[in-house]
Interface confidence: low
């Protein structure tokens, strides 16, 4: 069967890293520099992805596999295969149309990417606030007020008003 298939389609014999060159009587030619074929039987080689600008090379291109990119320090990947790089922000910030902005009061972000998320509402679980939240950290919920031993006290969270200078995102 293999013999029959190769008689019907000589290109099926061309391995990954080569292409079936119609200009040379379907000889298997090596992929030229900066191109690759990841499977056999290919009639062309694909151009290697180039990691330029804010992208940097995580894995070099080879004759059989494409280059893989990640982002330079200060940026992180977005999209399948790191198709985009997005600016990092500090913890306690989120990226907006106008750049990095501090999280509004009552929200936090403990990463350099993503959006600010609301503090956990401890009272929904019948618990009290043990440690106040910050821009960088969520609140820590403690035992329910009824479970507190004499002398222990929970932190009363401040009213969820916005801090001066922090507009809604």
């Amino acid at each position: 069967f293999e013999r029959t298939r190769s008689l019907q389609d000589p290109c099926s014999n061309c391995p990954a890293g080569t292409f079936c060159d119609n200009n040379r009587n379907q000889i298997c030619s090596p992929c030229p520099p900066n191109s690759f074929s990841s499977a056999g039987g290919q009639r062309t080689c694909d151009i290697c992805r180039q990691c330029k600008g804010v992208f940097r090379t995580r894995k070099e291109c080879s004759s059989t596999s494409n280059a893989e990119c990640d982002c330079t320090p200060g940026f992180h990947c977005l999209g399948a295969g790191c198709s985009m790089c997005e600016q990092d922000c500090k913890q306690g910030q989120e990226l907006t149309k106008k750049g990095c902005k501090d999280c509004c009061f009552g929200t936090f972000n403990d990463q350099k990417r993503g959006i600010c998320r609301p503090w956990t509402n401890c009272s929904l679980d019948g618990k009290s606030v043990l440690v106040n939240g910050t821009k960088e950290r969520d609140v820590v919920c403690g035992p329910s007020p009824a479970d507190l031993s004499p002398g222990a006290s929970s932190v009363t969270p401040p009213a969820p008003a916005r801090e001066p200078g922090h507009s809604p995102q």
Epitope: K52, V54, S83, E86, E94
Partner: antibody
Framework: SVEESGGRLVTPGTPLTLTCTVS????????VTWVRQPPGKGLEWIGV?????ATAFATWAKGRFTMSKNSTTVALKVTSPTTEDTATYFC??????????????WGQGTLVTVSS | DIVMTQTPSSVSAAVGGTVTINCQAS??????LSWYQQKLGQPPKLLIY???TLESGVPSRFKGSGSGTEYTLTISDLESDDAATYYC??????????????FGGGTGVVVK
């Protein structure tokens, strides 16, 4: 190479799809950018579609256009054309880089005329 | 969104002369700037990217420079074939999940 097609005379509000057909390179590793040029005016960037199908549009173009692709073509749909959308529409191969895209292979353009 | 202000809107110079085109961004664009040439009835042609990198096959008479918000395209030893409209194009960050690019208004170059 890249080649645009689908440009024609349409009445306002009639959806129109333009097609960019590529050859000699793979859309798996390149982005495709759409730019338009109203008669006698400058270039206007519309949007880009990346290797993984992710899209980005100019602020003015959001909601007015959609983009999709398969292995050899990229489609730009003008959802509800107005007379202001009369222009030559170009597609171009771009570096697959969200922060420094430049377009180094352009089609000849396809003319869209929107008129009642 | 970023605004790219290109000056002058048109310029005239003699063969062999030098032309300078400026492009000012409304904010720092970190050299993410390209220059294109467009002749009548033709698509744009990439000349320079990343502010100063010459595209393959483009004559060294074309020079890009600048940083921050101010960028310049200089065409020296002007030839009649350089008569065209020139556009700058820059990156901008449009939103958390999207990016975009914007063109300057264009500069027409007339060669006498």
């Amino acid at each position: 190479s890249v080649e645009e097609s689908g440009g024609r005379l349409v009445t306002p509000g009639t959806p129109l799809t333009l097609t960019c057909t590529v050859s000699g390179f793979s859309l798996t590793y390149y982005a495709v950018t759409w730019v338009r040029q109203p008669p006698g005016k400058g270039l206007e960037w519309i949007g880009v579609i990346y290797d993984n199908g992710a899209t980005a549009f100019a602020t003015w173009a959001k909601g007015r256009f959609t983009m999709s692709k398969n292995s050899t073509t990229v489609a730009l749909k003008v959802t509800s054309p107005t007379t202001e959308d009369t222009a030559t529409y170009f597609c171009a191969r771009s570096a697959n880089n969200a922060w420094s895209t430049y377009s180094n292979l352009w089609g000849q353009g396809t003319l869209v005329t929107v008129s009642s | 969104d970023i605004v790219m202000t290109q000056t002058p809107s048109s310029v005239s110079a003699a063969v062999g002369g030098t032309v300078t085109i400026n492009c000012q961004a409304s904010e720092d664009i970190s050299s993410y700037l390209s220059w294109y040439q467009q002749k009548l009835g033709q698509p744009p042609k990439l000349l320079i990217y990343k502010a100063s990198t010459l595209e393959s096959g483009v004559p060294s008479r074309f020079k890009g420079s600048g940083s921050g918000t101010e960028y310049t395209l200089t065409i020296s030893d002007l030839e009649s074939d350089d008569a065209a409209t020139y556009y700058c194009q820059s990156y901008y960050s449009g939103s958390i999940s999207g990016y975009g690019f914007v063109f300057g208004g264009g500069t027409g170059v007339v060669v006498k």
